[in-house]
């Protein structure tokens, strides 16, 4: 069966200067290729983390991905600012020249609140 | 207090149409996701579909894809069902169900309109 | 689909007994499940979310439990009221959106 990306969150709301979870788990590793995360959608879409060696500031990995059974890929955003809001997406990739997308998660709306 | 009131309800024929109405005060209805769930006679709880609050998201349940279009009109405040190509199966007290607004459960539902489909 | 199965389908039991009521998620549904309370010609009432987070205005004798597959309802003590049927659902998948078959809490 295809895999899916679930995020169970519709929206999470959460003030400036603190931390953030947004959950996002996947039903099978397979097809192998990276897990992604993306604030909007279409072009304009801005990748948030990528569950590689590359060093994100402020977005950290939850739980260990590189573990061989793990399908938990949510992130961690820290210290939040009002430029954080917005919809942010979970998307699976099968590995390629380049990699192509084949599933997204349902999106995960954050709200940033006034301390 | 968080209001919703079903209607449109009735006996009608196989393969007829019926539209069901859903009006909501207390919240702000546009800021919600709203659902209609039913329940046939002696059965359980049965999820048909979804609308988000700006009415962009849609999902239904495979039974009715096909034959049922959720709708909502945000300046009236009221959720519609329009079920065409009814059968018998279709036979249940259909309820309007408001989302939380972080999960997917129901946290407020109607009392819920009888359809009835029957030669 | 997530398919959800209770048990037992009935409970028959007499107030001020204690009931519990079994939810059986045929994947991980980690903590997102709901439980409702339904009575006849009334409409579904939420009681649980989260697993085990009450709702607003319930009662403390109703507490919910599980993660996971494998999810609990349970009432310390019956009152008159609590006979009625219960289901659980699951918001973890999103759409379909899933509820067990129900469980009928009965006068012994």
């Known amino acids: 069966t295809e895999v899916k990306v679930i995020q169970p969150e519709k929206s999470v709301s959460v003030a400036a200067g603190d931390s953030t979870v947004l959950n996002c788990t996947l039903t099978s590793l397979l097809p192998v290729g990276p897990i992604r995360w993306y604030r909007g959608v279409g072009q304009s879409r801005q990748l948030i983390y990528s569950f590689t060696t590359e060093h994100f500031p402020r977005v950290t990995n939850v739980s260990d991905a590189t573990k061989r059974s793990n399908l938990d890929f949510s992130i961690r955003i820290s210290n939040v600012t009002p430029e954080d809001a917005g919809t942010y997406y979970c998307v699976k990739f099968q590995r390629g020249s380049p990699d192509t997308e084949i599933q997204s998660g349902g999106g995960t709306e954050v709200y940033v609140l006034a301390k | 207090e968080v209001q919703l009131v079903e209607s449109g309800g009735g006996v009608v024929q196989p393969g007829r149409s019926l539209r069901l109405s859903c009006a909501a005060s207390g919240f702000t209805f546009s800021s919600y996701d709203v659902n209609w769930v039913r329940q046939a006679p002696g059965k359980g709880l049965e999820w048909v579909s979804l609308i988000s609050g700006s009415g962009e998201i849609i999902y239904y349940a495979d039974s009715v894809k096909g034959r049922f279009t959720i709708s909502r009109d945000n300046s009236k405040n009221t959720l519609y069902l329009q079920m065409n190509s009814l059968r018998a199966e279709d036979t249940a007290v259909y309820y309007c169900?408001?989302?939380?607004?972080?999960?997917?459960?129901?946290?407020?539902w109607g009392q819920g309109t009888l359809v009835t489909v029957s030669s | 689909e997530i398919v959800l199965t209770q048990s037992p389908g009935t409970l028959s039991l007499s107030p001020g007994e204690r009931a519990t009521l079994s939810c059986r998620a045929s994947?991980?549904?980690?903590?997102?499940l709901a439980w409702y309370q339904e009575k006849p010609g009334q409409a579904p009432r939420l009681l649980i979310y989260g697993a085990s987070s009450r709702a607003t205005g319930i009662p403390d004798r109703f507490s919910g439990s599980g993660s996971g597959t494998e999810f609990t309802l349970t009432i310390s003590s019956l009152q008159s009221e609590d006979f009625a049927v219960y289901y659980c659902?699951?918001?973890?998948?999103?759409?379909?959106?899933?509820f067990g078959g129900g469980t009928k809490v009965e006068i012994k």
């Open positions: 994947q991980s549904v980690y903590t997102y």
């Open positions: 169900a408001k989302e939380n607004n972080r999960y997917r459960f129901f946290d407020d």
């Open positions: 659902q699951q918001y973890y998948d999103r759409p379909p959106l899933t």
